[in-house]
């Protein structure tokens, strides 16, 4: 069951309720363990884990990435500006995930898990997030469109793609989860 | 117990490309969320660290070696190598493979405690 | 030039205590609670002695403890034995994704 569901809490009334940042925090451990899953079953299937980053730099995908000016590193450290990075950035990967969707033949179920525990992620920080005006959700039209040039590249591309959106969703998350430990 | 062992030529010529393979036993470096580093040592100097494999096989590099490293891994042969281009007599050093990834390192991407270490192999760049 | 500042040698005396310090950035000691500390006897591999700024690793004597304020960590041995003699090395995650180490600090151990 993701952690973003209530049935493990049920299941063990005697256990103290998860904090917010508890519940926040175990939602990105629980997605990161899904990435992982879902690597295992794209290194397998192409030579994509072995691509250096010079060849995933060619790549002309706009995802998500920490910045200084973001607010989430140590040094210049705001915590209202970290969490809007983080609520946009996931925003943002929310149409990458999409892609996934069809991509995983063995880890389907694995996709739409990391998929749907994305979105309570983000409700979980939405919840946190004082400054609700700041954040900027992505244009449906925009991303139906990107969708659909994802969905249209050679297997080659598409291959790369899923590995990039991937690892860079991995490290989003893990930037993510050491700023907000820090908050 | 997890073993590692540094393997590769002793002696390299300036220019070439340095060349070593750390074998682990006791242990699969594909099933744990473990990474796997690598530091060196020159002469009679302090430790520098150089680069990590995690778990997911993404690599991580020391900014001042960056255009001169590469990590990779060979998750069959349960070994993970190092190759260090362009090399100057600078770059003699003992160099370690270990462990690195305690606790929540994988969550968080923090491969700062490295607690099984390889003996070292003594590397020597010179004509 | 290490990225994290160490006294190149300290000395002290069997039985007492002797703190060796670790100065960083807020980039790297300040930036979590990502720190180790290793011990180099002479002539062999470096060993893990604490992690996560504080926790000892398997098997390390409680007389070997850690702390950290702000930019600055500090490893404490207590009760000094002449084996303890060794270059000890302070470690840190660096943001982004990579990792330093201290220049490493010899102890000296007087009888």
């Known amino acids: 069951v993701p952690p973003g569901e209530d049935s493990k809490d049920v299941a063990a009334p005697h256990r103290q309720p998860l904090t917010s940042s508890e519940r926040i925090d175990k939602q990105i451990r629980y997605i990161l363990d899904g990435i992982s899953a879902l690597r295992k079953e794209t290194c397998n299937k192409s030579n994509m884990c072995e691509s250096s980053k010079e060849a995933l730099a060619e790549n002309n995908l706009n995802l998500p990435k920490m910045a200084e000016k973001d607010g989430c590193f140590q040094s210049g450290f705001n915590e209202e500006t970290c969490l809007v990075k983080i609520i946009t950035g996931l925003l943002e990967f929310e149409v990458y995930l999409e892609y996934l969707q069809n991509r995983f033949e063995s880890s389907e179920e694995q996709a739409r898990a990391v998929q749907m525990s994305t979105k309570v992620l983000i409700q979980f920080l939405q919840k946190k997030a004082k400054n609700l005006d700041a954040i900027t959700t992505p244009d449906p039209t925009t991303n139906a469109s990107l969708l659909t040039k994802l969905q249209a590249q050679n297997q080659w591309l598409q291959d790369m793609t899923t590995h990039l959106i991937l690892r860079s969703f991995k490290e989003f998350l893990q930037s993510s989860l050491r700023a907000l430990r820090q908050m | 117990e997890v073993q590692l062992q540094e393997s590769g030529p002793g002696l390299v010529k300036p220019s070439q490309t340095l060349s070593l393979t750390c074998t682990v036993s006791?242990?699969?470096?594909?099933?744990?969320?473990?990474?796997w580093s690598w530091i060196r040592q020159p002469p009679g100097k302090g430790l520098e660290w150089m680069g990590v494999i995690d778990y997911d096989g993404d690599t991580y590099y020391k900014p001042s070696l960056k255009s001169r490293t590469s990590i990779s891994r060979d998750t069959s042969k349960n070994q993970f190598s190092l190759q260090l281009s362009s090399v100057t007599p600078e770059d003699t050093a003992v160099y370690y493979c270990?462990?690195?990834?305690?606790?929540?390192?994988?969550?968080?991407?923090?491969?700062?405690?490295?607690?099984?270490w390889g003996k070292g192999t003594l590397v020597t760049v010179s004509s | 030039q290490s990225a994290l500042t160490q006294p190149p040698s300290m000395s002290g005396t069997l039985g007492k205590t002797l703190t060796i310090s670790c100065n960083g950035t807020s980039s790297d000691i300040g930036s979590g609670d990502y720190v180790s500390w290793y011990q180099q006897l002479p002539g062999t591999t470096p060993k893990l002695l604490i992690e996560?700024?504080?926790t000892r690793a398997s098997g390390i004597p409680d007389r070997f403890s850690a702390s950290k304020s702000d930019n600055t960590a500090s490893l404490t041995i207590s009760g000094l034995q002449s084996e303890d003699e060794a270059t000890y090395y302070c470690a840190s995650y660096r943001e982004t994704n990579n990792v330093v180490f201290g220049g490493g600090t010899h102890l000296t151990v007087l009888s």
């Open positions: 270990a462990r690195a990834g305690l606790g929540d390192s994988y969550y968080l991407g923090t491969y700062y405690a490295m607690d099984y």
């Open positions: 006791g242990g699969s470096i594909a099933t744990s969320y473990y990474a």
């Open positions: 996560g700024v504080t």
